[in-house]
Interface confidence: low
């Protein structure tokens, strides 16, 4: 075993949009830090066989299996997968190690299995075995976290029933509004399930696993804040737990808080109170209203009252099934080439939606912003002034929603021409869709003012890729115009563009752009 080479097997995960990943099994640029797969000698096997740790890959992920060989002299190699041999091109790195790579692009079920690499060096022959399988994400779930009171303690537990087990964190913020965004310095994150500090302004719990991240905000009424113009609304599904926090600050402890549902006091055991003195010696009280599993009759106006503050209410609506409310009628917009413009969709939804914006089969991330009136809004501004169809798609556990937008960019026509033995055609994608004129250039009309009306056929066609309209005009050739120059002009309210075509000339047709 003295002569055996030192072998290292690694897995490189590529980001899906990484254009550095090659199409062949030659060495691609590394886009993620390599993961060591071990490569231990397999005992009791005939010949020298190394086995790498099993590799689990997400569907559509791109990976590279790579072997680094520390052995003197040249090496030759061969990959075998499902009884087919695959090309293998070793090269040497800066430390003079032999490097052999196998790139798997956009992993599918058919690419799962055993990959055998046979290596022949000057000293010895050996085999390396990789087992690649697709990660079974069908069993994966990521559920929105919910709150429970910790037994015998004034603390909340954050629970997310997800597979694989998620990492749970509390996201706390003590300032108002915009400064409570995730990246803000005012935000503190605690990676733990139990939270004792329940007096903060904004409290959220988030759970994350391989499927992403889901958060739930502790719904709060702050009696020291000016009430919103519209009543805050909280939606829950039957069976979910209800948690509402009422918070108030006063100069001393001489005040109390109470919860009422539709003017009736909440039952004992459905609330608990906490209080503390703040740094400036004022008293902060919070009163939680909670129902461990809501039913339809828990719907109503929940009012928090104080002996020293005006009371405030929230409307709690219990629904059987989630929903997405928005108008799904398609919308058409027309803008100038440099005009700032964003598509926007205003919606009310529960549970929170996942959404995407799509243009020309490419998806873009979708951001949502909550509005004061219980609605949310998603805007898309990254259209780069490309005309066509834009699609907003949203879904949650129970509902789906799609809305179509068409963007038209106002611009002067640009004309392209082509000709054959029997006809000449001109195309334009200016907007508004242009009108066409054809003119004949002759001795009598050197400025090409003689209009052609016979044999002209205009049409508009949808360029399917972008949902963008293109207008075309075709002139069928007649004896009267053979051998002449003709001019096709497209015009709209922004201008005119023309092309001149020599009909029936030998060889390629000359086109003269004429603006």
């Amino acid at each position: 075993n003295q002569d055996l080479p030192v072998i290292k097997c690694v897995l490189i995960n590529h980001k899906n949009n990484d254009s550095s990943v090659g199409k062949s099994s030659s060495y691609p640029m590394v886009s993620e830090s390599p993961e060591d797969l071990g490569c231990a000698l397999r005992p009791q096997s005939s010949g020298t066989v190394y086995e790498a740790a099993a590799v689990e890959v997400d569907v559509s992920a791109s990976i590279t299996l790579q072997v680094l060989v520390d052995a003197p002299g040249n090496i030759s190699c061969l990959w075998v997968f499902k009884h087919s041999s695959l090309n293998c091109q070793p090269h040497f790195d800066l430390q003079n190690r032999g490097v052999v790579s196998m790139v798997i692009l956009k992993m599918t079920e058919t690419q799962a299995g055993e990959y055998l690499l046979f290596i022949q060096s000057e000293a010895t022959n050996y085999t390396i075995l990789f087992t690649v399988s697709i990660r079974n994400t069908l069993l994966y779930t990521l559920r929105r976290p919910y709150f429970r009171k910790m037994e015998n303690q004034d603390a909340l537990v954050c629970i997310s029933e997800s597979v694989p087990e998620p990492i749970v964190e509390w996201v706390l913020c003590d300032s108002q509004g915009e400064s409570c965004k995730e990246e803000s310095p005012a935000v503190v994150k605690k990676e733990e399930k139990v939270l004792h500090e329940l007096f903060g302004t904004d409290i959220r719990c988030c759970a994350r696993n391989e499927l992403g991240r889901e958060c739930t905000r502790l719904f709060t009424i702050d009696l020291n804040q000016t009430p919103q113009t519209t009543l805050p609304q909280l939606f829950l599904k039957v069976g979910e737990p209800l948690w509402i926090r009422c918070k108030a600050v006063h100069v001393n402890h001489g005040f109390g808080l109470t919860w009422e549902l539709e003017n009736k006091a909440l039952e004992e055991g459905n609330y608990f109170e906490m209080s503390t003195y703040s740094t400036n010696r004022t008293m902060i009280r919070i009163l939680f209203a909670f129902v461990s599993s809501v039913a339809r009759n828990d719907t109503g106006y929940y009012t928090c009252s104080s002996s020293k503050h005006p009371s405030q209410s929230a409307l709690v609506t219990i629904v059987e099934k989630g929903f997405i409310n928005a108008t799904n009628s398609s919308e058409d917009y027309e803008i100038d080439q440099y005009e700032e413009f964003c598509f926007s969709v205003r919606f009310k939804a529960y549970p929170q939606i996942r959404c995407t914006w799509t243009f020309s089969r490419k998806s873009f991330p979708c951001e949502q912003k909550g509005l004061d009136n219980g609605y949310s809004i998603s805007k898309f501004c990254n259209h780069k002034h490309q005309p066509g169809e834009y699609i907003f798609h949203a879904e949650n556990d129970d509902a789906q929603f799609t809305k179509m937008f068409t963007l038209n960019i106002r611009r002067k026509p640009q004309v392209l021409a082509e000709a054959s033995a029997s006809q000449a055609s001109c195309f334009s994608d200016g907007y508004p869709l242009p009108s066409w004129t054809w003119k004949k250039c002759s001795d009598k009309s050197p400025n090409c003012t003689e209009e052609i009306t016979e044999g002209v056929w205009n049409r508009k066609a949808n360029r399917k890729v972008f949902g963008q309209w293109v207008s075309s005009s075709t002139l069928n050739m007649s004896e009267a115009i053979k051998g002449f120059l003709v001019k096709c002009c497209a015009y709209n309210s922004l201008g005119t563009s023309c092309e001149t075509i020599l009909l029936n000339s030998p060889g390629p047709f000359p086109f003269i752009q004429d603006n």
């Epitope: 009628s329 919308e331 058409d332 917009y333 027309e334 068409t406 038209n408 106002r410 508004p432």
Partner: nanobody, 111 residues
């Protein structure tokens, strides 16, 4: 789907005035440009005027000064005020939003 309906056309003597209206159904009216076009008998349709979503106006140079375009977003309606009309203004007048056109309204100016 946007639907447009022009009105206000008619027979008028040279030097007279008319006010054309273009009423629209559909939610995207206020967000979009409105164009007026006209088509005289035996001639191509020609652009007349435009008002942007922000209320800026543009005119065919030869008509500027005589024609005024305006809009009332609350009523989903655009207007074309035509003064000092000439016989050569005789045409069917159309309004357009995006790729939607009205049926047109006939304006006839007699000398």
């Amino acid at each position: 789907q946007v639907q447009l309906q022009e009105s206000g056309g008619g027979l008028v003597q040279a030097g007279g005035s008319l006010r054309l209206s273009c009423s629209a159904s559909g939610s995207t009216f206020s967000r979009n440009y409105i164009d007026w076009y006209r088509q005289a008998p035996g001639k191509q349709r020609e652009w007349v005027a435009q008002i942007t979503s922000g209320g800026n106006t543009h005119y065919e140079p030869s008509l500027k000064g005589r024609f005024t375009i305006s809009r009332d977003n609350a009523k989903n309606t655009a207007y074309l005020q035509m003064n000092s009309l000439k016989p050569e203004d005789t045409a069917v007048y159309y309004c357009r939003i995006l790729d939607y056109w009205g049926q047109g309204t006939q304006v006839t100016v007699s000398s």
